[in-house]
């Protein structure tokens, strides 16, 4: 299953399959997740080692047993690949690293006014993989405000150096934020020229295109079909690049198919997995296991659950079957693609779904009336769990926020439904940033069921929590995916990086905002909070957040929305915006429903009809 815990001061011994430089453990983990054979990783921050060559070292590891011996190493961080972790799988990495220079091939230099502008330039340049920006205080005046766009053979820095007044980061193309746009068309009987960066075997052009999209240096591809004249080249997928970023020439060629990487698509990227099953096709590779199962879909599920399995063949040969079960061959290779593809067989083949974003779990958990005042604009995909709860009576208006916690579940505040308990009047918008983008054609979710906490009473602050079951499940994308829930009764974790988001009022007597706002707010102890609200009872099922001096807070229209905190690189839903005395007043923190205290209730209510809790447990 999915394992998300990180091991501090620990290093996995042996099992190395690749190594590279990454700026932090989270990026190292992402590279492990997307590497076909990596199950475990170890990362050496700059502070953990004197050897300059090994600083920022990211070591990707494999193990037949799924684990490796851990040795103590001060400062080292180790962990697991996020294969099988559903919506947590993403190649998008937004962080900016201060005081760090990520080295690579510098192919473009320009003057910009901010690191964000530099990142935007990288994202909008077809060849840029990462960048470095020299701030206004950089020691050499002539380099100040320089934005260096970079690439490297592996897509990661060739070296990382600690350097004052330099900030570095990665292209946001994997976040589907590129302004370049993409070519969706694929061209039959056409072969592209230029430099081959990799060669893999694929069953069709679609798989070839997805592999190209997630390969760090592939910009376009040519696929040779299974009826290509040269037998040894059949099903070959050639991943290609060029200096210009586009093919310099193309040749009409029967039984070839060419196309482009979809990494520059805006708003939608293909999933990093291949879910189609190919009847009459055998995939060859290294044998991992053979098991008897009933049906090709069960064979695919078996492969997906066995984390090292990359692809499979389900044989329908009479000698491979007994009763209703047939042999399911679980296989792997060095590059994650079959080493041989045979047609006209009595098998059906396909790939593991371990990198698919869409698990079938309805709630994500982890083991281990009020807008934002004093906030700033959010950007696309920054808070992909945030939803807008809108009511359509004569006109339509935003009333509350909410958090997507599963394909079919939204968590919000009970008081949002005071006086509006009818599910038909509600429309739930997900995957949006600007309320003004909502038109009559914008898709929305309707409510199947509103589940208000049984102990909630109107005009009381207690148990201000409600679940919404959507009529139809939502697909996950970079802009629409769930927030993980804390573990039950989570009291030991000290959260230092917490944010509240919403479209609510920007001042007490204000109006709903167009762009989703965000504000970084520190948590306040319940004792401190109780002192500020002497007329109310602050229970252990509430959590407070705010600045002593005020100025930043949630406000009307943010109710039901998330208070999220980042811990060990992972966001968790700590609170639900509930109530407060005015907005952003001095010494009047916002009060939030403490989600950890309601985990039993959430899990009980989100249980599937067959009585099984459909929840994802990354640890």
């Amino acid at each position: 299953g999915c394992l998300t815990q990180l091991y501090e001061n620990a290093f996995f011994r042996g099992g190395d399959v690749a190594s590279m430089y990454t700026p932090n453990a989270q990026y190292c983990q992402m590279r492990c997740t997307f590497h076909p054979r990596c199950l475990l990783f170890s990362f050496l921050p700059a502070s953990s080692i004197n050897d300059m060559e090994k600083r920022f070292g990211c070591f990707l590891k494999d193990s037949v047993t799924g684990t490796l011996p851990k040795v103590h190493r001060t400062g080292a961080v180790s962990g697991h690949s996020l294969k099988q972790c559903g919506h947590q799988i993403s190649a998008c990495h937004r962080d900016i690293y201060k005081g760090v220079d990520m080295r690579g091939v510098n192919f473009n230099v320009s003057k910009v006014s901010s690191v964000e502008e530099c990142q935007k330039r990288c994202t909008s340049n077809i060849r840029c993989q990462f960048f470095s920006y020299a701030t206004q205080t950089f020691h050499k005046a002539e380099y100040r405000n320089n934005c260096l766009l970079k690439y490297s053979p592996g897509g990661t820095p060739t070296a990382i150096k600690v350097l004052s007044n330099v900030e570095s980061g990665f292209s946001l193309k994997p976040c589907a934020l590129s302004e370049i746009g993409c070519h969706m068309n694929i061209f039959q009987h056409l072969a592209f020229s230029d430099v081959d960066v990799a060669r893999v075997l694929t069953p069709d052009a679609f798989v070839c295109r997805t592999i190209c999209t997630y390969h760090p240096n592939c910009l376009f591809f040519t696929f040779y079909t299974n009826v290509w004249k040269i037998e040894s080249q059949r099903n070959v997928c050639l991943l290609k690049t060029s200096e210009s970023g586009t093919p310099s020439s193309s040749t009409p060629q029967e039984n070839t198919i060419s196309g482009y990487s979809l990494l520059t698509c805006k708003r939608t990227l293909p999933e990093p997995c291949h879910s189609k099953i190919y009847p009459g096709v055998d995939f060859g590779g290294e044998e991992l296991n053979v098991t008897f199962v009933k049906g090709v879909n069960v064979c695919q599920e078996t492969c997906t659950k066995m984390i090292r399995c990359q692809f499979f063949t389900y044989s329908l040969l009479p000698e491979d079957c007994k009763e209703e079960k047939c042999k399911c061959f679980l296989r792997l290779s060095m590059d994650g693609s079959p080493t041989r593809i045979a047609y006209g067989t009595q098998g059906s083949s396909g790939y593991s779904l371990r990198l698919c974003n869409t698990g079938d779990n309805s709630v994500c958990t982890t083991k281990t009336s009020t807008r934002i005042v004093g906030g700033t604009n959010s950007s696309w995909g920054e808070w992909p769990w945030q939803v807008s709860l809108q009511v359509k009576l004569t006109a339509q208006r935003h009333l509350c926020g909410g958090s997507l916690i599963g394909h079919q579940w939204v968590l919000t505040a009970a008081h949002c439904f005071d006086g509006l308990p009818l599910q038909d009047v509600w429309r739930i918008y997900s995957g949006i940033l600007n309320l003004s983008d909502i038109t009559k054609d914008t898709p929305f979710s309707q409510i199947k069921e509103i589940i208000i906490h049984q102990n909630y009473k109107v005009s009381e602050g207690n148990h201000d929590i409600a679940l919404i079951k959507l009529q139809a499940p939502l697909n996950y994308t970079e802009f629409q995916k769930p927030i993980c829930l804390p573990s039950k009764g989570d009291t030991s974790t000290i959260y230092t990086n917490c944010w509240v988001t919403g479209w609510g009022f920007s001042k007490e007597k204000g109006e709903i905002q167009n762009i989703l706002q965000k504000v970084n707010i520190p948590l306040v102890t319940n004792e401190e909070c109780q002192k500020r609200y002497q007329d109310y009872k602050i229970t252990q099922r509430m959590v407070c957040a705010g600045y002593k001096e005020g100025g930043k807070d949630a406000c009307k229209g943010d109710s039901g929305g998330p208070l999220v905190c980042k811990h060990n690189g992972m966001w968790r839903l700590v609170g639900i915006t509930s109530w407060g005395e005015g907005c952003a007043r001095r010494e009047q923190p916002g009060v939030y429903t403490k989600v950890a205290e309601y985990m039993d209730w959430i899990l009980e209510k989100t249980q599937s009809s067959d009585g099984k809790a459909q929840m994802q447990s990354p640890a």
């Epitope: 969706m184 039959q188 679609f206 009826v227 039984n255 099953i277 009847p279 047609y343």
Partner: antibody, heavy 119, light 107 residues
Amino acid sequence: EVQLLESGGGLVQPGGSLRLSCAASGFTFSTYEMYWVRQAPGKGLEWVSGIGSSGGMTMYADSVKGRFTISRDNSKNTLYLQMNSLRAEDTAMYYCAREQPGIAALQFWGQGTLVTVSS
Amino acid sequence: DIQMTQSPSSLSASVGDRVTITCRASQSISSYLNWYQQKPGKAPKLLIYAASSLQSGVPSRFSGSGSGTDFTLTISSLQPEDFATYYCQQSYSTPPTFGQGTKVEIK
């Protein structure tokens, strides 16, 4: 030039049998997956059956499973559909089609042969 | 089986009109979506494959878009020869399934 030519259709009583043929030319027949698709009068298209390049893998729509058998003779460049226990609802124009490798689309179609099941 | 739902089932339009036909799959089919045109008494003809790629010989006024579950066929400026029935088809899983068709008639 790719050509597909169906034959064998006609009028048959319920419970009866027919064998459709599809003669292929203009391409290397033995390397392509082939399909039968039908269209009832005034209705939409319905996939009936498919067969792998060597004939080892066969697939059927639930509505014809157990009654129809798809086969091919690569030496004769011919695709067949043996239809037994015919019903009135099997009345349709039957098309043979060739899948285009790598893109999973039915790129070439025959002109169709009409099967009428009636007493 | 994956259900393919086309809308509208029929439409009346004039020469020069922009026509849009939508197709929705009951589950995600990635880009494994094809569009066919069929004229009375004729076999279907492939127009668009892989959701958005124009088949060779098909006029550029035809275009396709979409991925996942929602797809669109657009005829930018309807011509007399375009009056026909249009079908979408998913090739993602067996059995491949077709939409019920959209008949484009002369207004």
